[in-house]
Interface confidence: medium
């Protein structure tokens, strides 16, 4: 569907407000260090230009691609080389290489200050003084810290952010109203960012086929009454949407996502009975709701899969005729029957089936060769089931904080070369699987747990890719997307690791720890725990527990002391000495 002016087309489709918001997100995700004011200026210039193209699509430069227009605009930034170094070299390239170059320079862990939340009254005043600037700043700050955040979903977050301030800044107790809402948005936002980061990694590192396979499995679980042709159509459209967003084509992505939501709602009778409420909502809420909608009920009396995929004498003929369609149908049929399996498990089963057919269809007696293929699935299903059972038991026994600590120790021993902040962040998130998933009944535990772990381990993979330090991490991250979790689970203590030199400064604490929130205090203690394991990788659980218990008592004691700083200095020295003795350092 060719348009004379792509920028005019998108401006008209999306409307001025969404157009400006999406251009701001796009620019902030590319130039993550640029000041807010500079981005606003660029966005305003692009918007004014878009309006001239809406008025006359034949006007000068209106026929240029969005990448050309946006790239040219980004390359006008005066401080590009000083701020971004070699990224400035992108500007010497032509499209599409220039855009690819910008994409390669997106930084998953930009060196930006932590976002500190001002006092509620300060925020409410800023909101009332200039609502538009306040909301733009939110988009800018999230986008630059999360360069792969799903742009149309960020518009939904911004809408909720605005609603929270509109309601709470008029409330009698502003803080009681606002702070829980902001906490919820922050936590949901981090989760949304991480989920989208996995989708982009899947597309960019493993290709469209891998993403489509993931989408077939997930949508078949969610819409088990939909026919394969319907699921295939949704998968094709969803792949286009995410390819666009992950490629920085945010206007096209948002436009296509809206079209997909419209299609789903117009055809909900042939897709799912659970969509009715979602489809009554406005656009941003509708798209979000569809993305999160619960699985529909499975159709009654689905026939056994064995007849078509194992017992039939035509399996190899059918497979040879259209391999990906046949495998897609297998995945669809298996997934719609198994909402109790994780998507990654379903993909492992499909991969096993594919490998078996590749081998057996070249054998003398193919049917005899693949007759027992479903038996090969049993151990693949049991492995995550057993792992989840064991870890949920451990979580229920320890509680979240101590469960996180157990994982910190486990993962530090597996990959001690990884930076301490990354180990703390990833292990804390891995530990959240307990409270997130262990409360669910058996039938929901595996899809909750293993698919969540895939998201968290992808964080480890993208952070490690920026500064690779461990061949074992690289291997688990790059060999197979669906086997990342089993690969990390299978890692034992790294025997090649040379323990880190002891540095007393690492274990020196000050009175400022007493004013930290409980979460920040936990992070301090967990940072110390990782460092301990890096110094003494062979330390036993009992030794580490004893040291950590002493450390907790030390912090509690000194935070109650009259002269906190002196307490931390004197008692700290004793603690370090006692810990060294206990661990044999």
């Amino acid at each position: 569907d060719a348009h004379k002016s792509e920028v005019a087309h998108r401006f008209k489709d999306l409307g001025e407000e969404n157009f400006k918001a999406l251009v701001l997100i796009a620019f902030a995700q590319y130039l993550q260090q640029c000041p807010f004011e500079d981005h606003v200026k660029l966005v305003n210039e692009v918007t004014e230009f878009a309006k001239t193209c809406v008025a006359d699509e034949s006007a000068e430069n209106c026929d240029k691609s969005l990448h050309t227009l946006f790239g040219d605009k980004l390359c006008t930034v005066a401080t590009l080389r000083e701020t971004y170094g070699e990224m400035a070299d992108c500007c010497a390239k032509q499209e599409p290489e220039r855009n690819e170059c910008f994409l390669q320079h997106k930084d998953d862990n930009p060196n930006l200050p932590r976002l500190v939340r001002p006092e509620v009254d300060v925020m409410c005043t800023a909101f009332h003084d200039n609502e538009e600037t306040f909301l733009k700043k939110y988009l800018y700050e999230i986008a630059r810290r999360h360069p792969y955040f799903y742009a149309p979903e960020l518009l939904f977050f911004a809408k909720r952010y605005k609603a929270a301030f509109t309601e709470c800044c008029q409330a009698a107790d502003k803080a009681a109203c606002l702070l829980p809402k902001l906490d919820e948005l922050r936590d949901e936002g981090k989760a949304s960012s991480a989920k989208q980061r996995l989708k982009c990694a899947s597309l960019q590192k493993f290709g469209e086929r891998a993403f489509k396979a993931w989408a077939v499995a997930r949508l078949s679980q969610r819409f088990p009454k939909a026919e394969f042709a319907e699921v295939s159509k949704l998968v094709t459209d969803l792949t286009k949407v995410h390819t666009e967003c992950c490629h920085g084509d945010l206007l096209e992505c948002a436009d296509d996502r809206a079209d997909l939501a419209k299609y789903i709602c117009e055809n909900q009778d042939s897709i799912s009975s659970k969509l009715k409420e979602c489809c009554e909502k406005p656009l941003l809420e509708k798209s979000h709701c569809i993305a999160e909608v619960e699985n529909d009920e499975m159709p009654a009396d689905l026939p056994s899969l064995a007849a078509d995929f194992v017992e039939s004498k035509d399996v190899c003929k059918n497979y040879a005729e259209a391999k990906d369609v046949f495998l897609g149908m297998f995945l669809y049929e298996y997934a719609r029957r198994h909402p109790d399996y994780s998507v990654v498990l379903l993909l492992r089963l499909a991969k096993t089936y594919e490998t078996t057919l590749e081998k057996c269809c070249a054998a003398a007696d193919p049917h005899e060769c693949y007759a027992k293929v479903f038996d090969e699935f049993k151990p693949l299903v049991e492995e995550p089931q057993n792992l989840i059972k064991q870890n949920c038991e451990l979580f229920e026994q320890l509680g979240e904080y101590k469960f996180q600590n157990a994982l910190l120790v486990r993962y530090t021993k597996k990959v001690p070369q990884v930076s301490t902040p990354t180990l703390v962040e990833v292990s804390r998130n891995l530990g959240k699987v307990g409270s997130k998933c262990c409360k669910h009944p058996e039938a929901k535990r595996m899809p909750c747990a293993e698919d969540y772990l895939s998201v968290v381990l992808n964080q480890l993979c993208v952070l490690h890719e920026k500064t690779p330090v461990s061949d074992r991490v690289t291997k688990c991250c790059t060999e197979s997307l669906v086997n990342r979790r089993p690969c990390f689970s299978a890692l034992e203590v790294d025997e090649t690791y040379v323990p880190k030199e002891f540095n007393a400064e690492t274990f020196t604490f000050h009175a400022d720890i007493c004013t930290l929130s409980e979460k920040e205090r936990q992070i301090k203690k967990q940072t110390a725990l990782v460092e301990l394991v890096k110094h003494k990788p062979k330390a036993t659980k009992e030794q580490l527990k004893a040291v950590m218990d002493d450390f907790a008592a030390f912090v509690e004691k000194c935070c109650k002391a009259d002269d906190k700083e002196t307490c931390f200095a004197e008692e700290g020295k004793k603690l370090v000495a006692a810990s060294q003795a206990a661990l044999g350092l």
Epitope: S232, K233, N318, E321, A322, M329
Partner: nanobody
Framework: QLQVVESGGGLVQAGGSLRLSCAAS????????MGWFRQAPEKEREFVAG?????????DYADSVEGRFTISRDNAKNTAYLQMNNLKPEDTAVYYC????????????????????WGHGTQVTVSS
């Protein structure tokens, strides 16, 4: 939504031949059994022929057309065909192509309820 479009109908003398085509809009068409049905004026729609998916697929014919009609499919072109030879006046009807939603290995059903996607039909008139 999967679109189905028939073509190739027309007026033919008794004893003559016609070849009907059925084009599907999606590649996933190859994963389904498909069938031809017909409806003569003042009569119920009836099954004519069916074919299951992929190469070497199972075929099925109504007794009234067995030996005269041949159903085939070209998955590369997302198209199915009905070759009609030795046509009779009683073959006059609107011919509909339909795509099923059964499992891939399933035989093509004769029951209209097992077909989800239907074309608008193409008129075949056989004059005596």
């Amino acid at each position: 939504q999967l679109q189905v479009v028939e073509s190739g109908g027309g007026l033919v003398q008794a004893g003559g031949s016609l070849r009907l085509s059925c084009a599907a809009s999606e590649r996933t068409f190859v994963a389904y059994p498909m069938g031809w049905f017909r409806q003569a004026p003042e009569k119920e729609r009836e099954f004519v022929a069916g074919i299951s998916w992929f190469a070497g697929a199972t075929t099925d014919y109504a007794d009234s057309v067995e030996g005269r009609f041949t159903i085939s499919r070209d998955n590369a072109k997302n198209t199915a065909y009905l070759q009609m030879n030795n046509l009779k006046p009683e073959d006059t009807a609107v011919y509909y192509c339909a795509i099923s939603h059964q499992l891939p290995g399933g035989r093509p059903g004769r029951d209209m309820d097992s077909y989800s996607y239907w074309g608008h039909g193409t008129q075949v008139t056989v004059s005596s």
